[in-house]
C-alpha cells in the first residue's frame, strides 16, 4: 500500500531572467527512493538516479542545474518557462509518487517568489 505523500513548493512565481528552485519532498513512507524525474509538461528535464547520479537533458543543460538535494534549479527564466512541472519519485517497494508545481514567470520586477521549500 502506498502511504507516502509528496510535498511541493506549490504555485510559485519568479522574475524573467531570474532563477527558481523546484523542490519536492516525499514523506510518510519508509520506501527507498530509487529515482526522481523532473518533467515540464511532456518534456523530461532531468533525472536523479540513486545509483547513476544526475543526468540533465542536453536541451536544457545551459539553464537547468541539479539540486539542491533532489530538487532542480531553473536559471535564466523566460516567460515560456511558465507552466506545470512534475517531480516523479520512483520508490521501492511503493511504486511511483508524483508531485506538481506551477511556475509563473513574470515580466514585472515585483514578482512574488513563493516560499522556498527546504528539505528537512
Amino acid at each position: 500500500m502506498m502511504t507516502g505523500t509528496i510535498e511541493t513548493t506549490g504555485n510559485i512565481s519568479a522574475e524573467k531572467g531570474g532563477s527558481i528552485i523546484l523542490q519536492c519532498h516525499l514523506s510518510s513512507t519508509t520506501a527507498q527512493v530509487t529515482q526522481v524525474n523532473w518533467e515540464q509538461q511532456d518534456q523530461l528535464l532531468a533525472i536523479c538516479n540513486a545509483d547513476l547520479g544526475w543526468h540533465i537533458s542536453p536541451s536544457f543543460k545551459d539553464r537547468v542545474a541539479p539540486g539542491p538535494g533532489l530538487g532542480l534549479t531553473l536559471q535564466s527564466l523566460t516567460v515560456n518557462d511558465t507552466g506545470e512541472y512534475f517531480c516523479i519519485y520512483h520508490t521501492y517497494p511503493d511504486g511511483t509518487y508524483t508531485g506538481r508545481i506551477f511556475l509563473e514567470v513574470l515580466e514585472s520586477s515585483v514578482a512574488e517568489h513563493g516560499a522556498r521549500f527546504q528539505i528537512p
Epitope: L52, G53, H55, S57, P58
Partner: antibody
Amino acid sequence: DVQLQESGPGLVKPSQSLSLTCTVTGYSITSGYDWHWIRHFPGNILEWMGYISDSGNTIYSPSLKSRISITHDTSKNHFFLKLNSVTSEDTATYYCARGSFWYFDVWGAGTTVTVSS
Amino acid sequence: DIQMTQSPASLSASVGETVTITCRVSENIYSYLAWYQQKQGKSPQLLVYNTKTLAEGVPSRFSGSGSGTQFSLKINSLQPEDFGSYYCQHHYGNPLTFGAGTKLELK
C-alpha cells in the same frame, strides 16, 4: 553529425593495463550527454563498463570498479578507458558510446582487443 | 544486478512476416528499457528507448511495448535490412545491463 572512434593497441599482455582512446567529432564532450565504454565479448555478451559525464563525474560498473578508470581531455575532445590487471577474459570488442539518460544513441565502430602473452 | 532474459535466442523468418522479441527483467524497471539492432561486424544501433519511443530515423514498422518487468519489440512486415541481432538494455540503475541477444535470420 556526431561521430565516435576508438583507438588503441589490439594486443595486450596479461597483468598489464589496457588503454583506449575515444575521439569524438561533431559534438563537444562538455556540452551535455554522458560518455560511456561498453564491451562485446566473443560469446555475444554486451557489458557496460562505466562513463564520464560532461562535467567529468565518473560512474563505474561495480564488477569493474577496482580496476577501471575513465578520464577525458576536453581540449582534444577525447575520453579514455584504462583497465588494469587484464586477463584473457578481457578479450573483447570495445565500444565508446554517447549516453542520454543511460541509453546509448551514438556508438563508435569498435576496436578489438586481445589479451594474450 | 538486474537480469535481462531475452527470448527467443534465435528466430527464422521471411521478408514480409511480423516477429516479436521479448525481454523479461528480474525487477521493476518501470519504462526504462531500450532496444538495439546489431548487424554482423557493425556496432549496435539504438532502435527504441523508454520502452516505446523510436530513435531518430527508425522506421515505424518497429514498435516497443511493456512496462515493469515484461517488454517486447515487434517488427511488422520484415525487410531484408532487418536481419541481424537484437538486444534489450535497461537504463534504470547501476550496472546497466543487456539481454543476451536474439539472432533474427532469414528463413
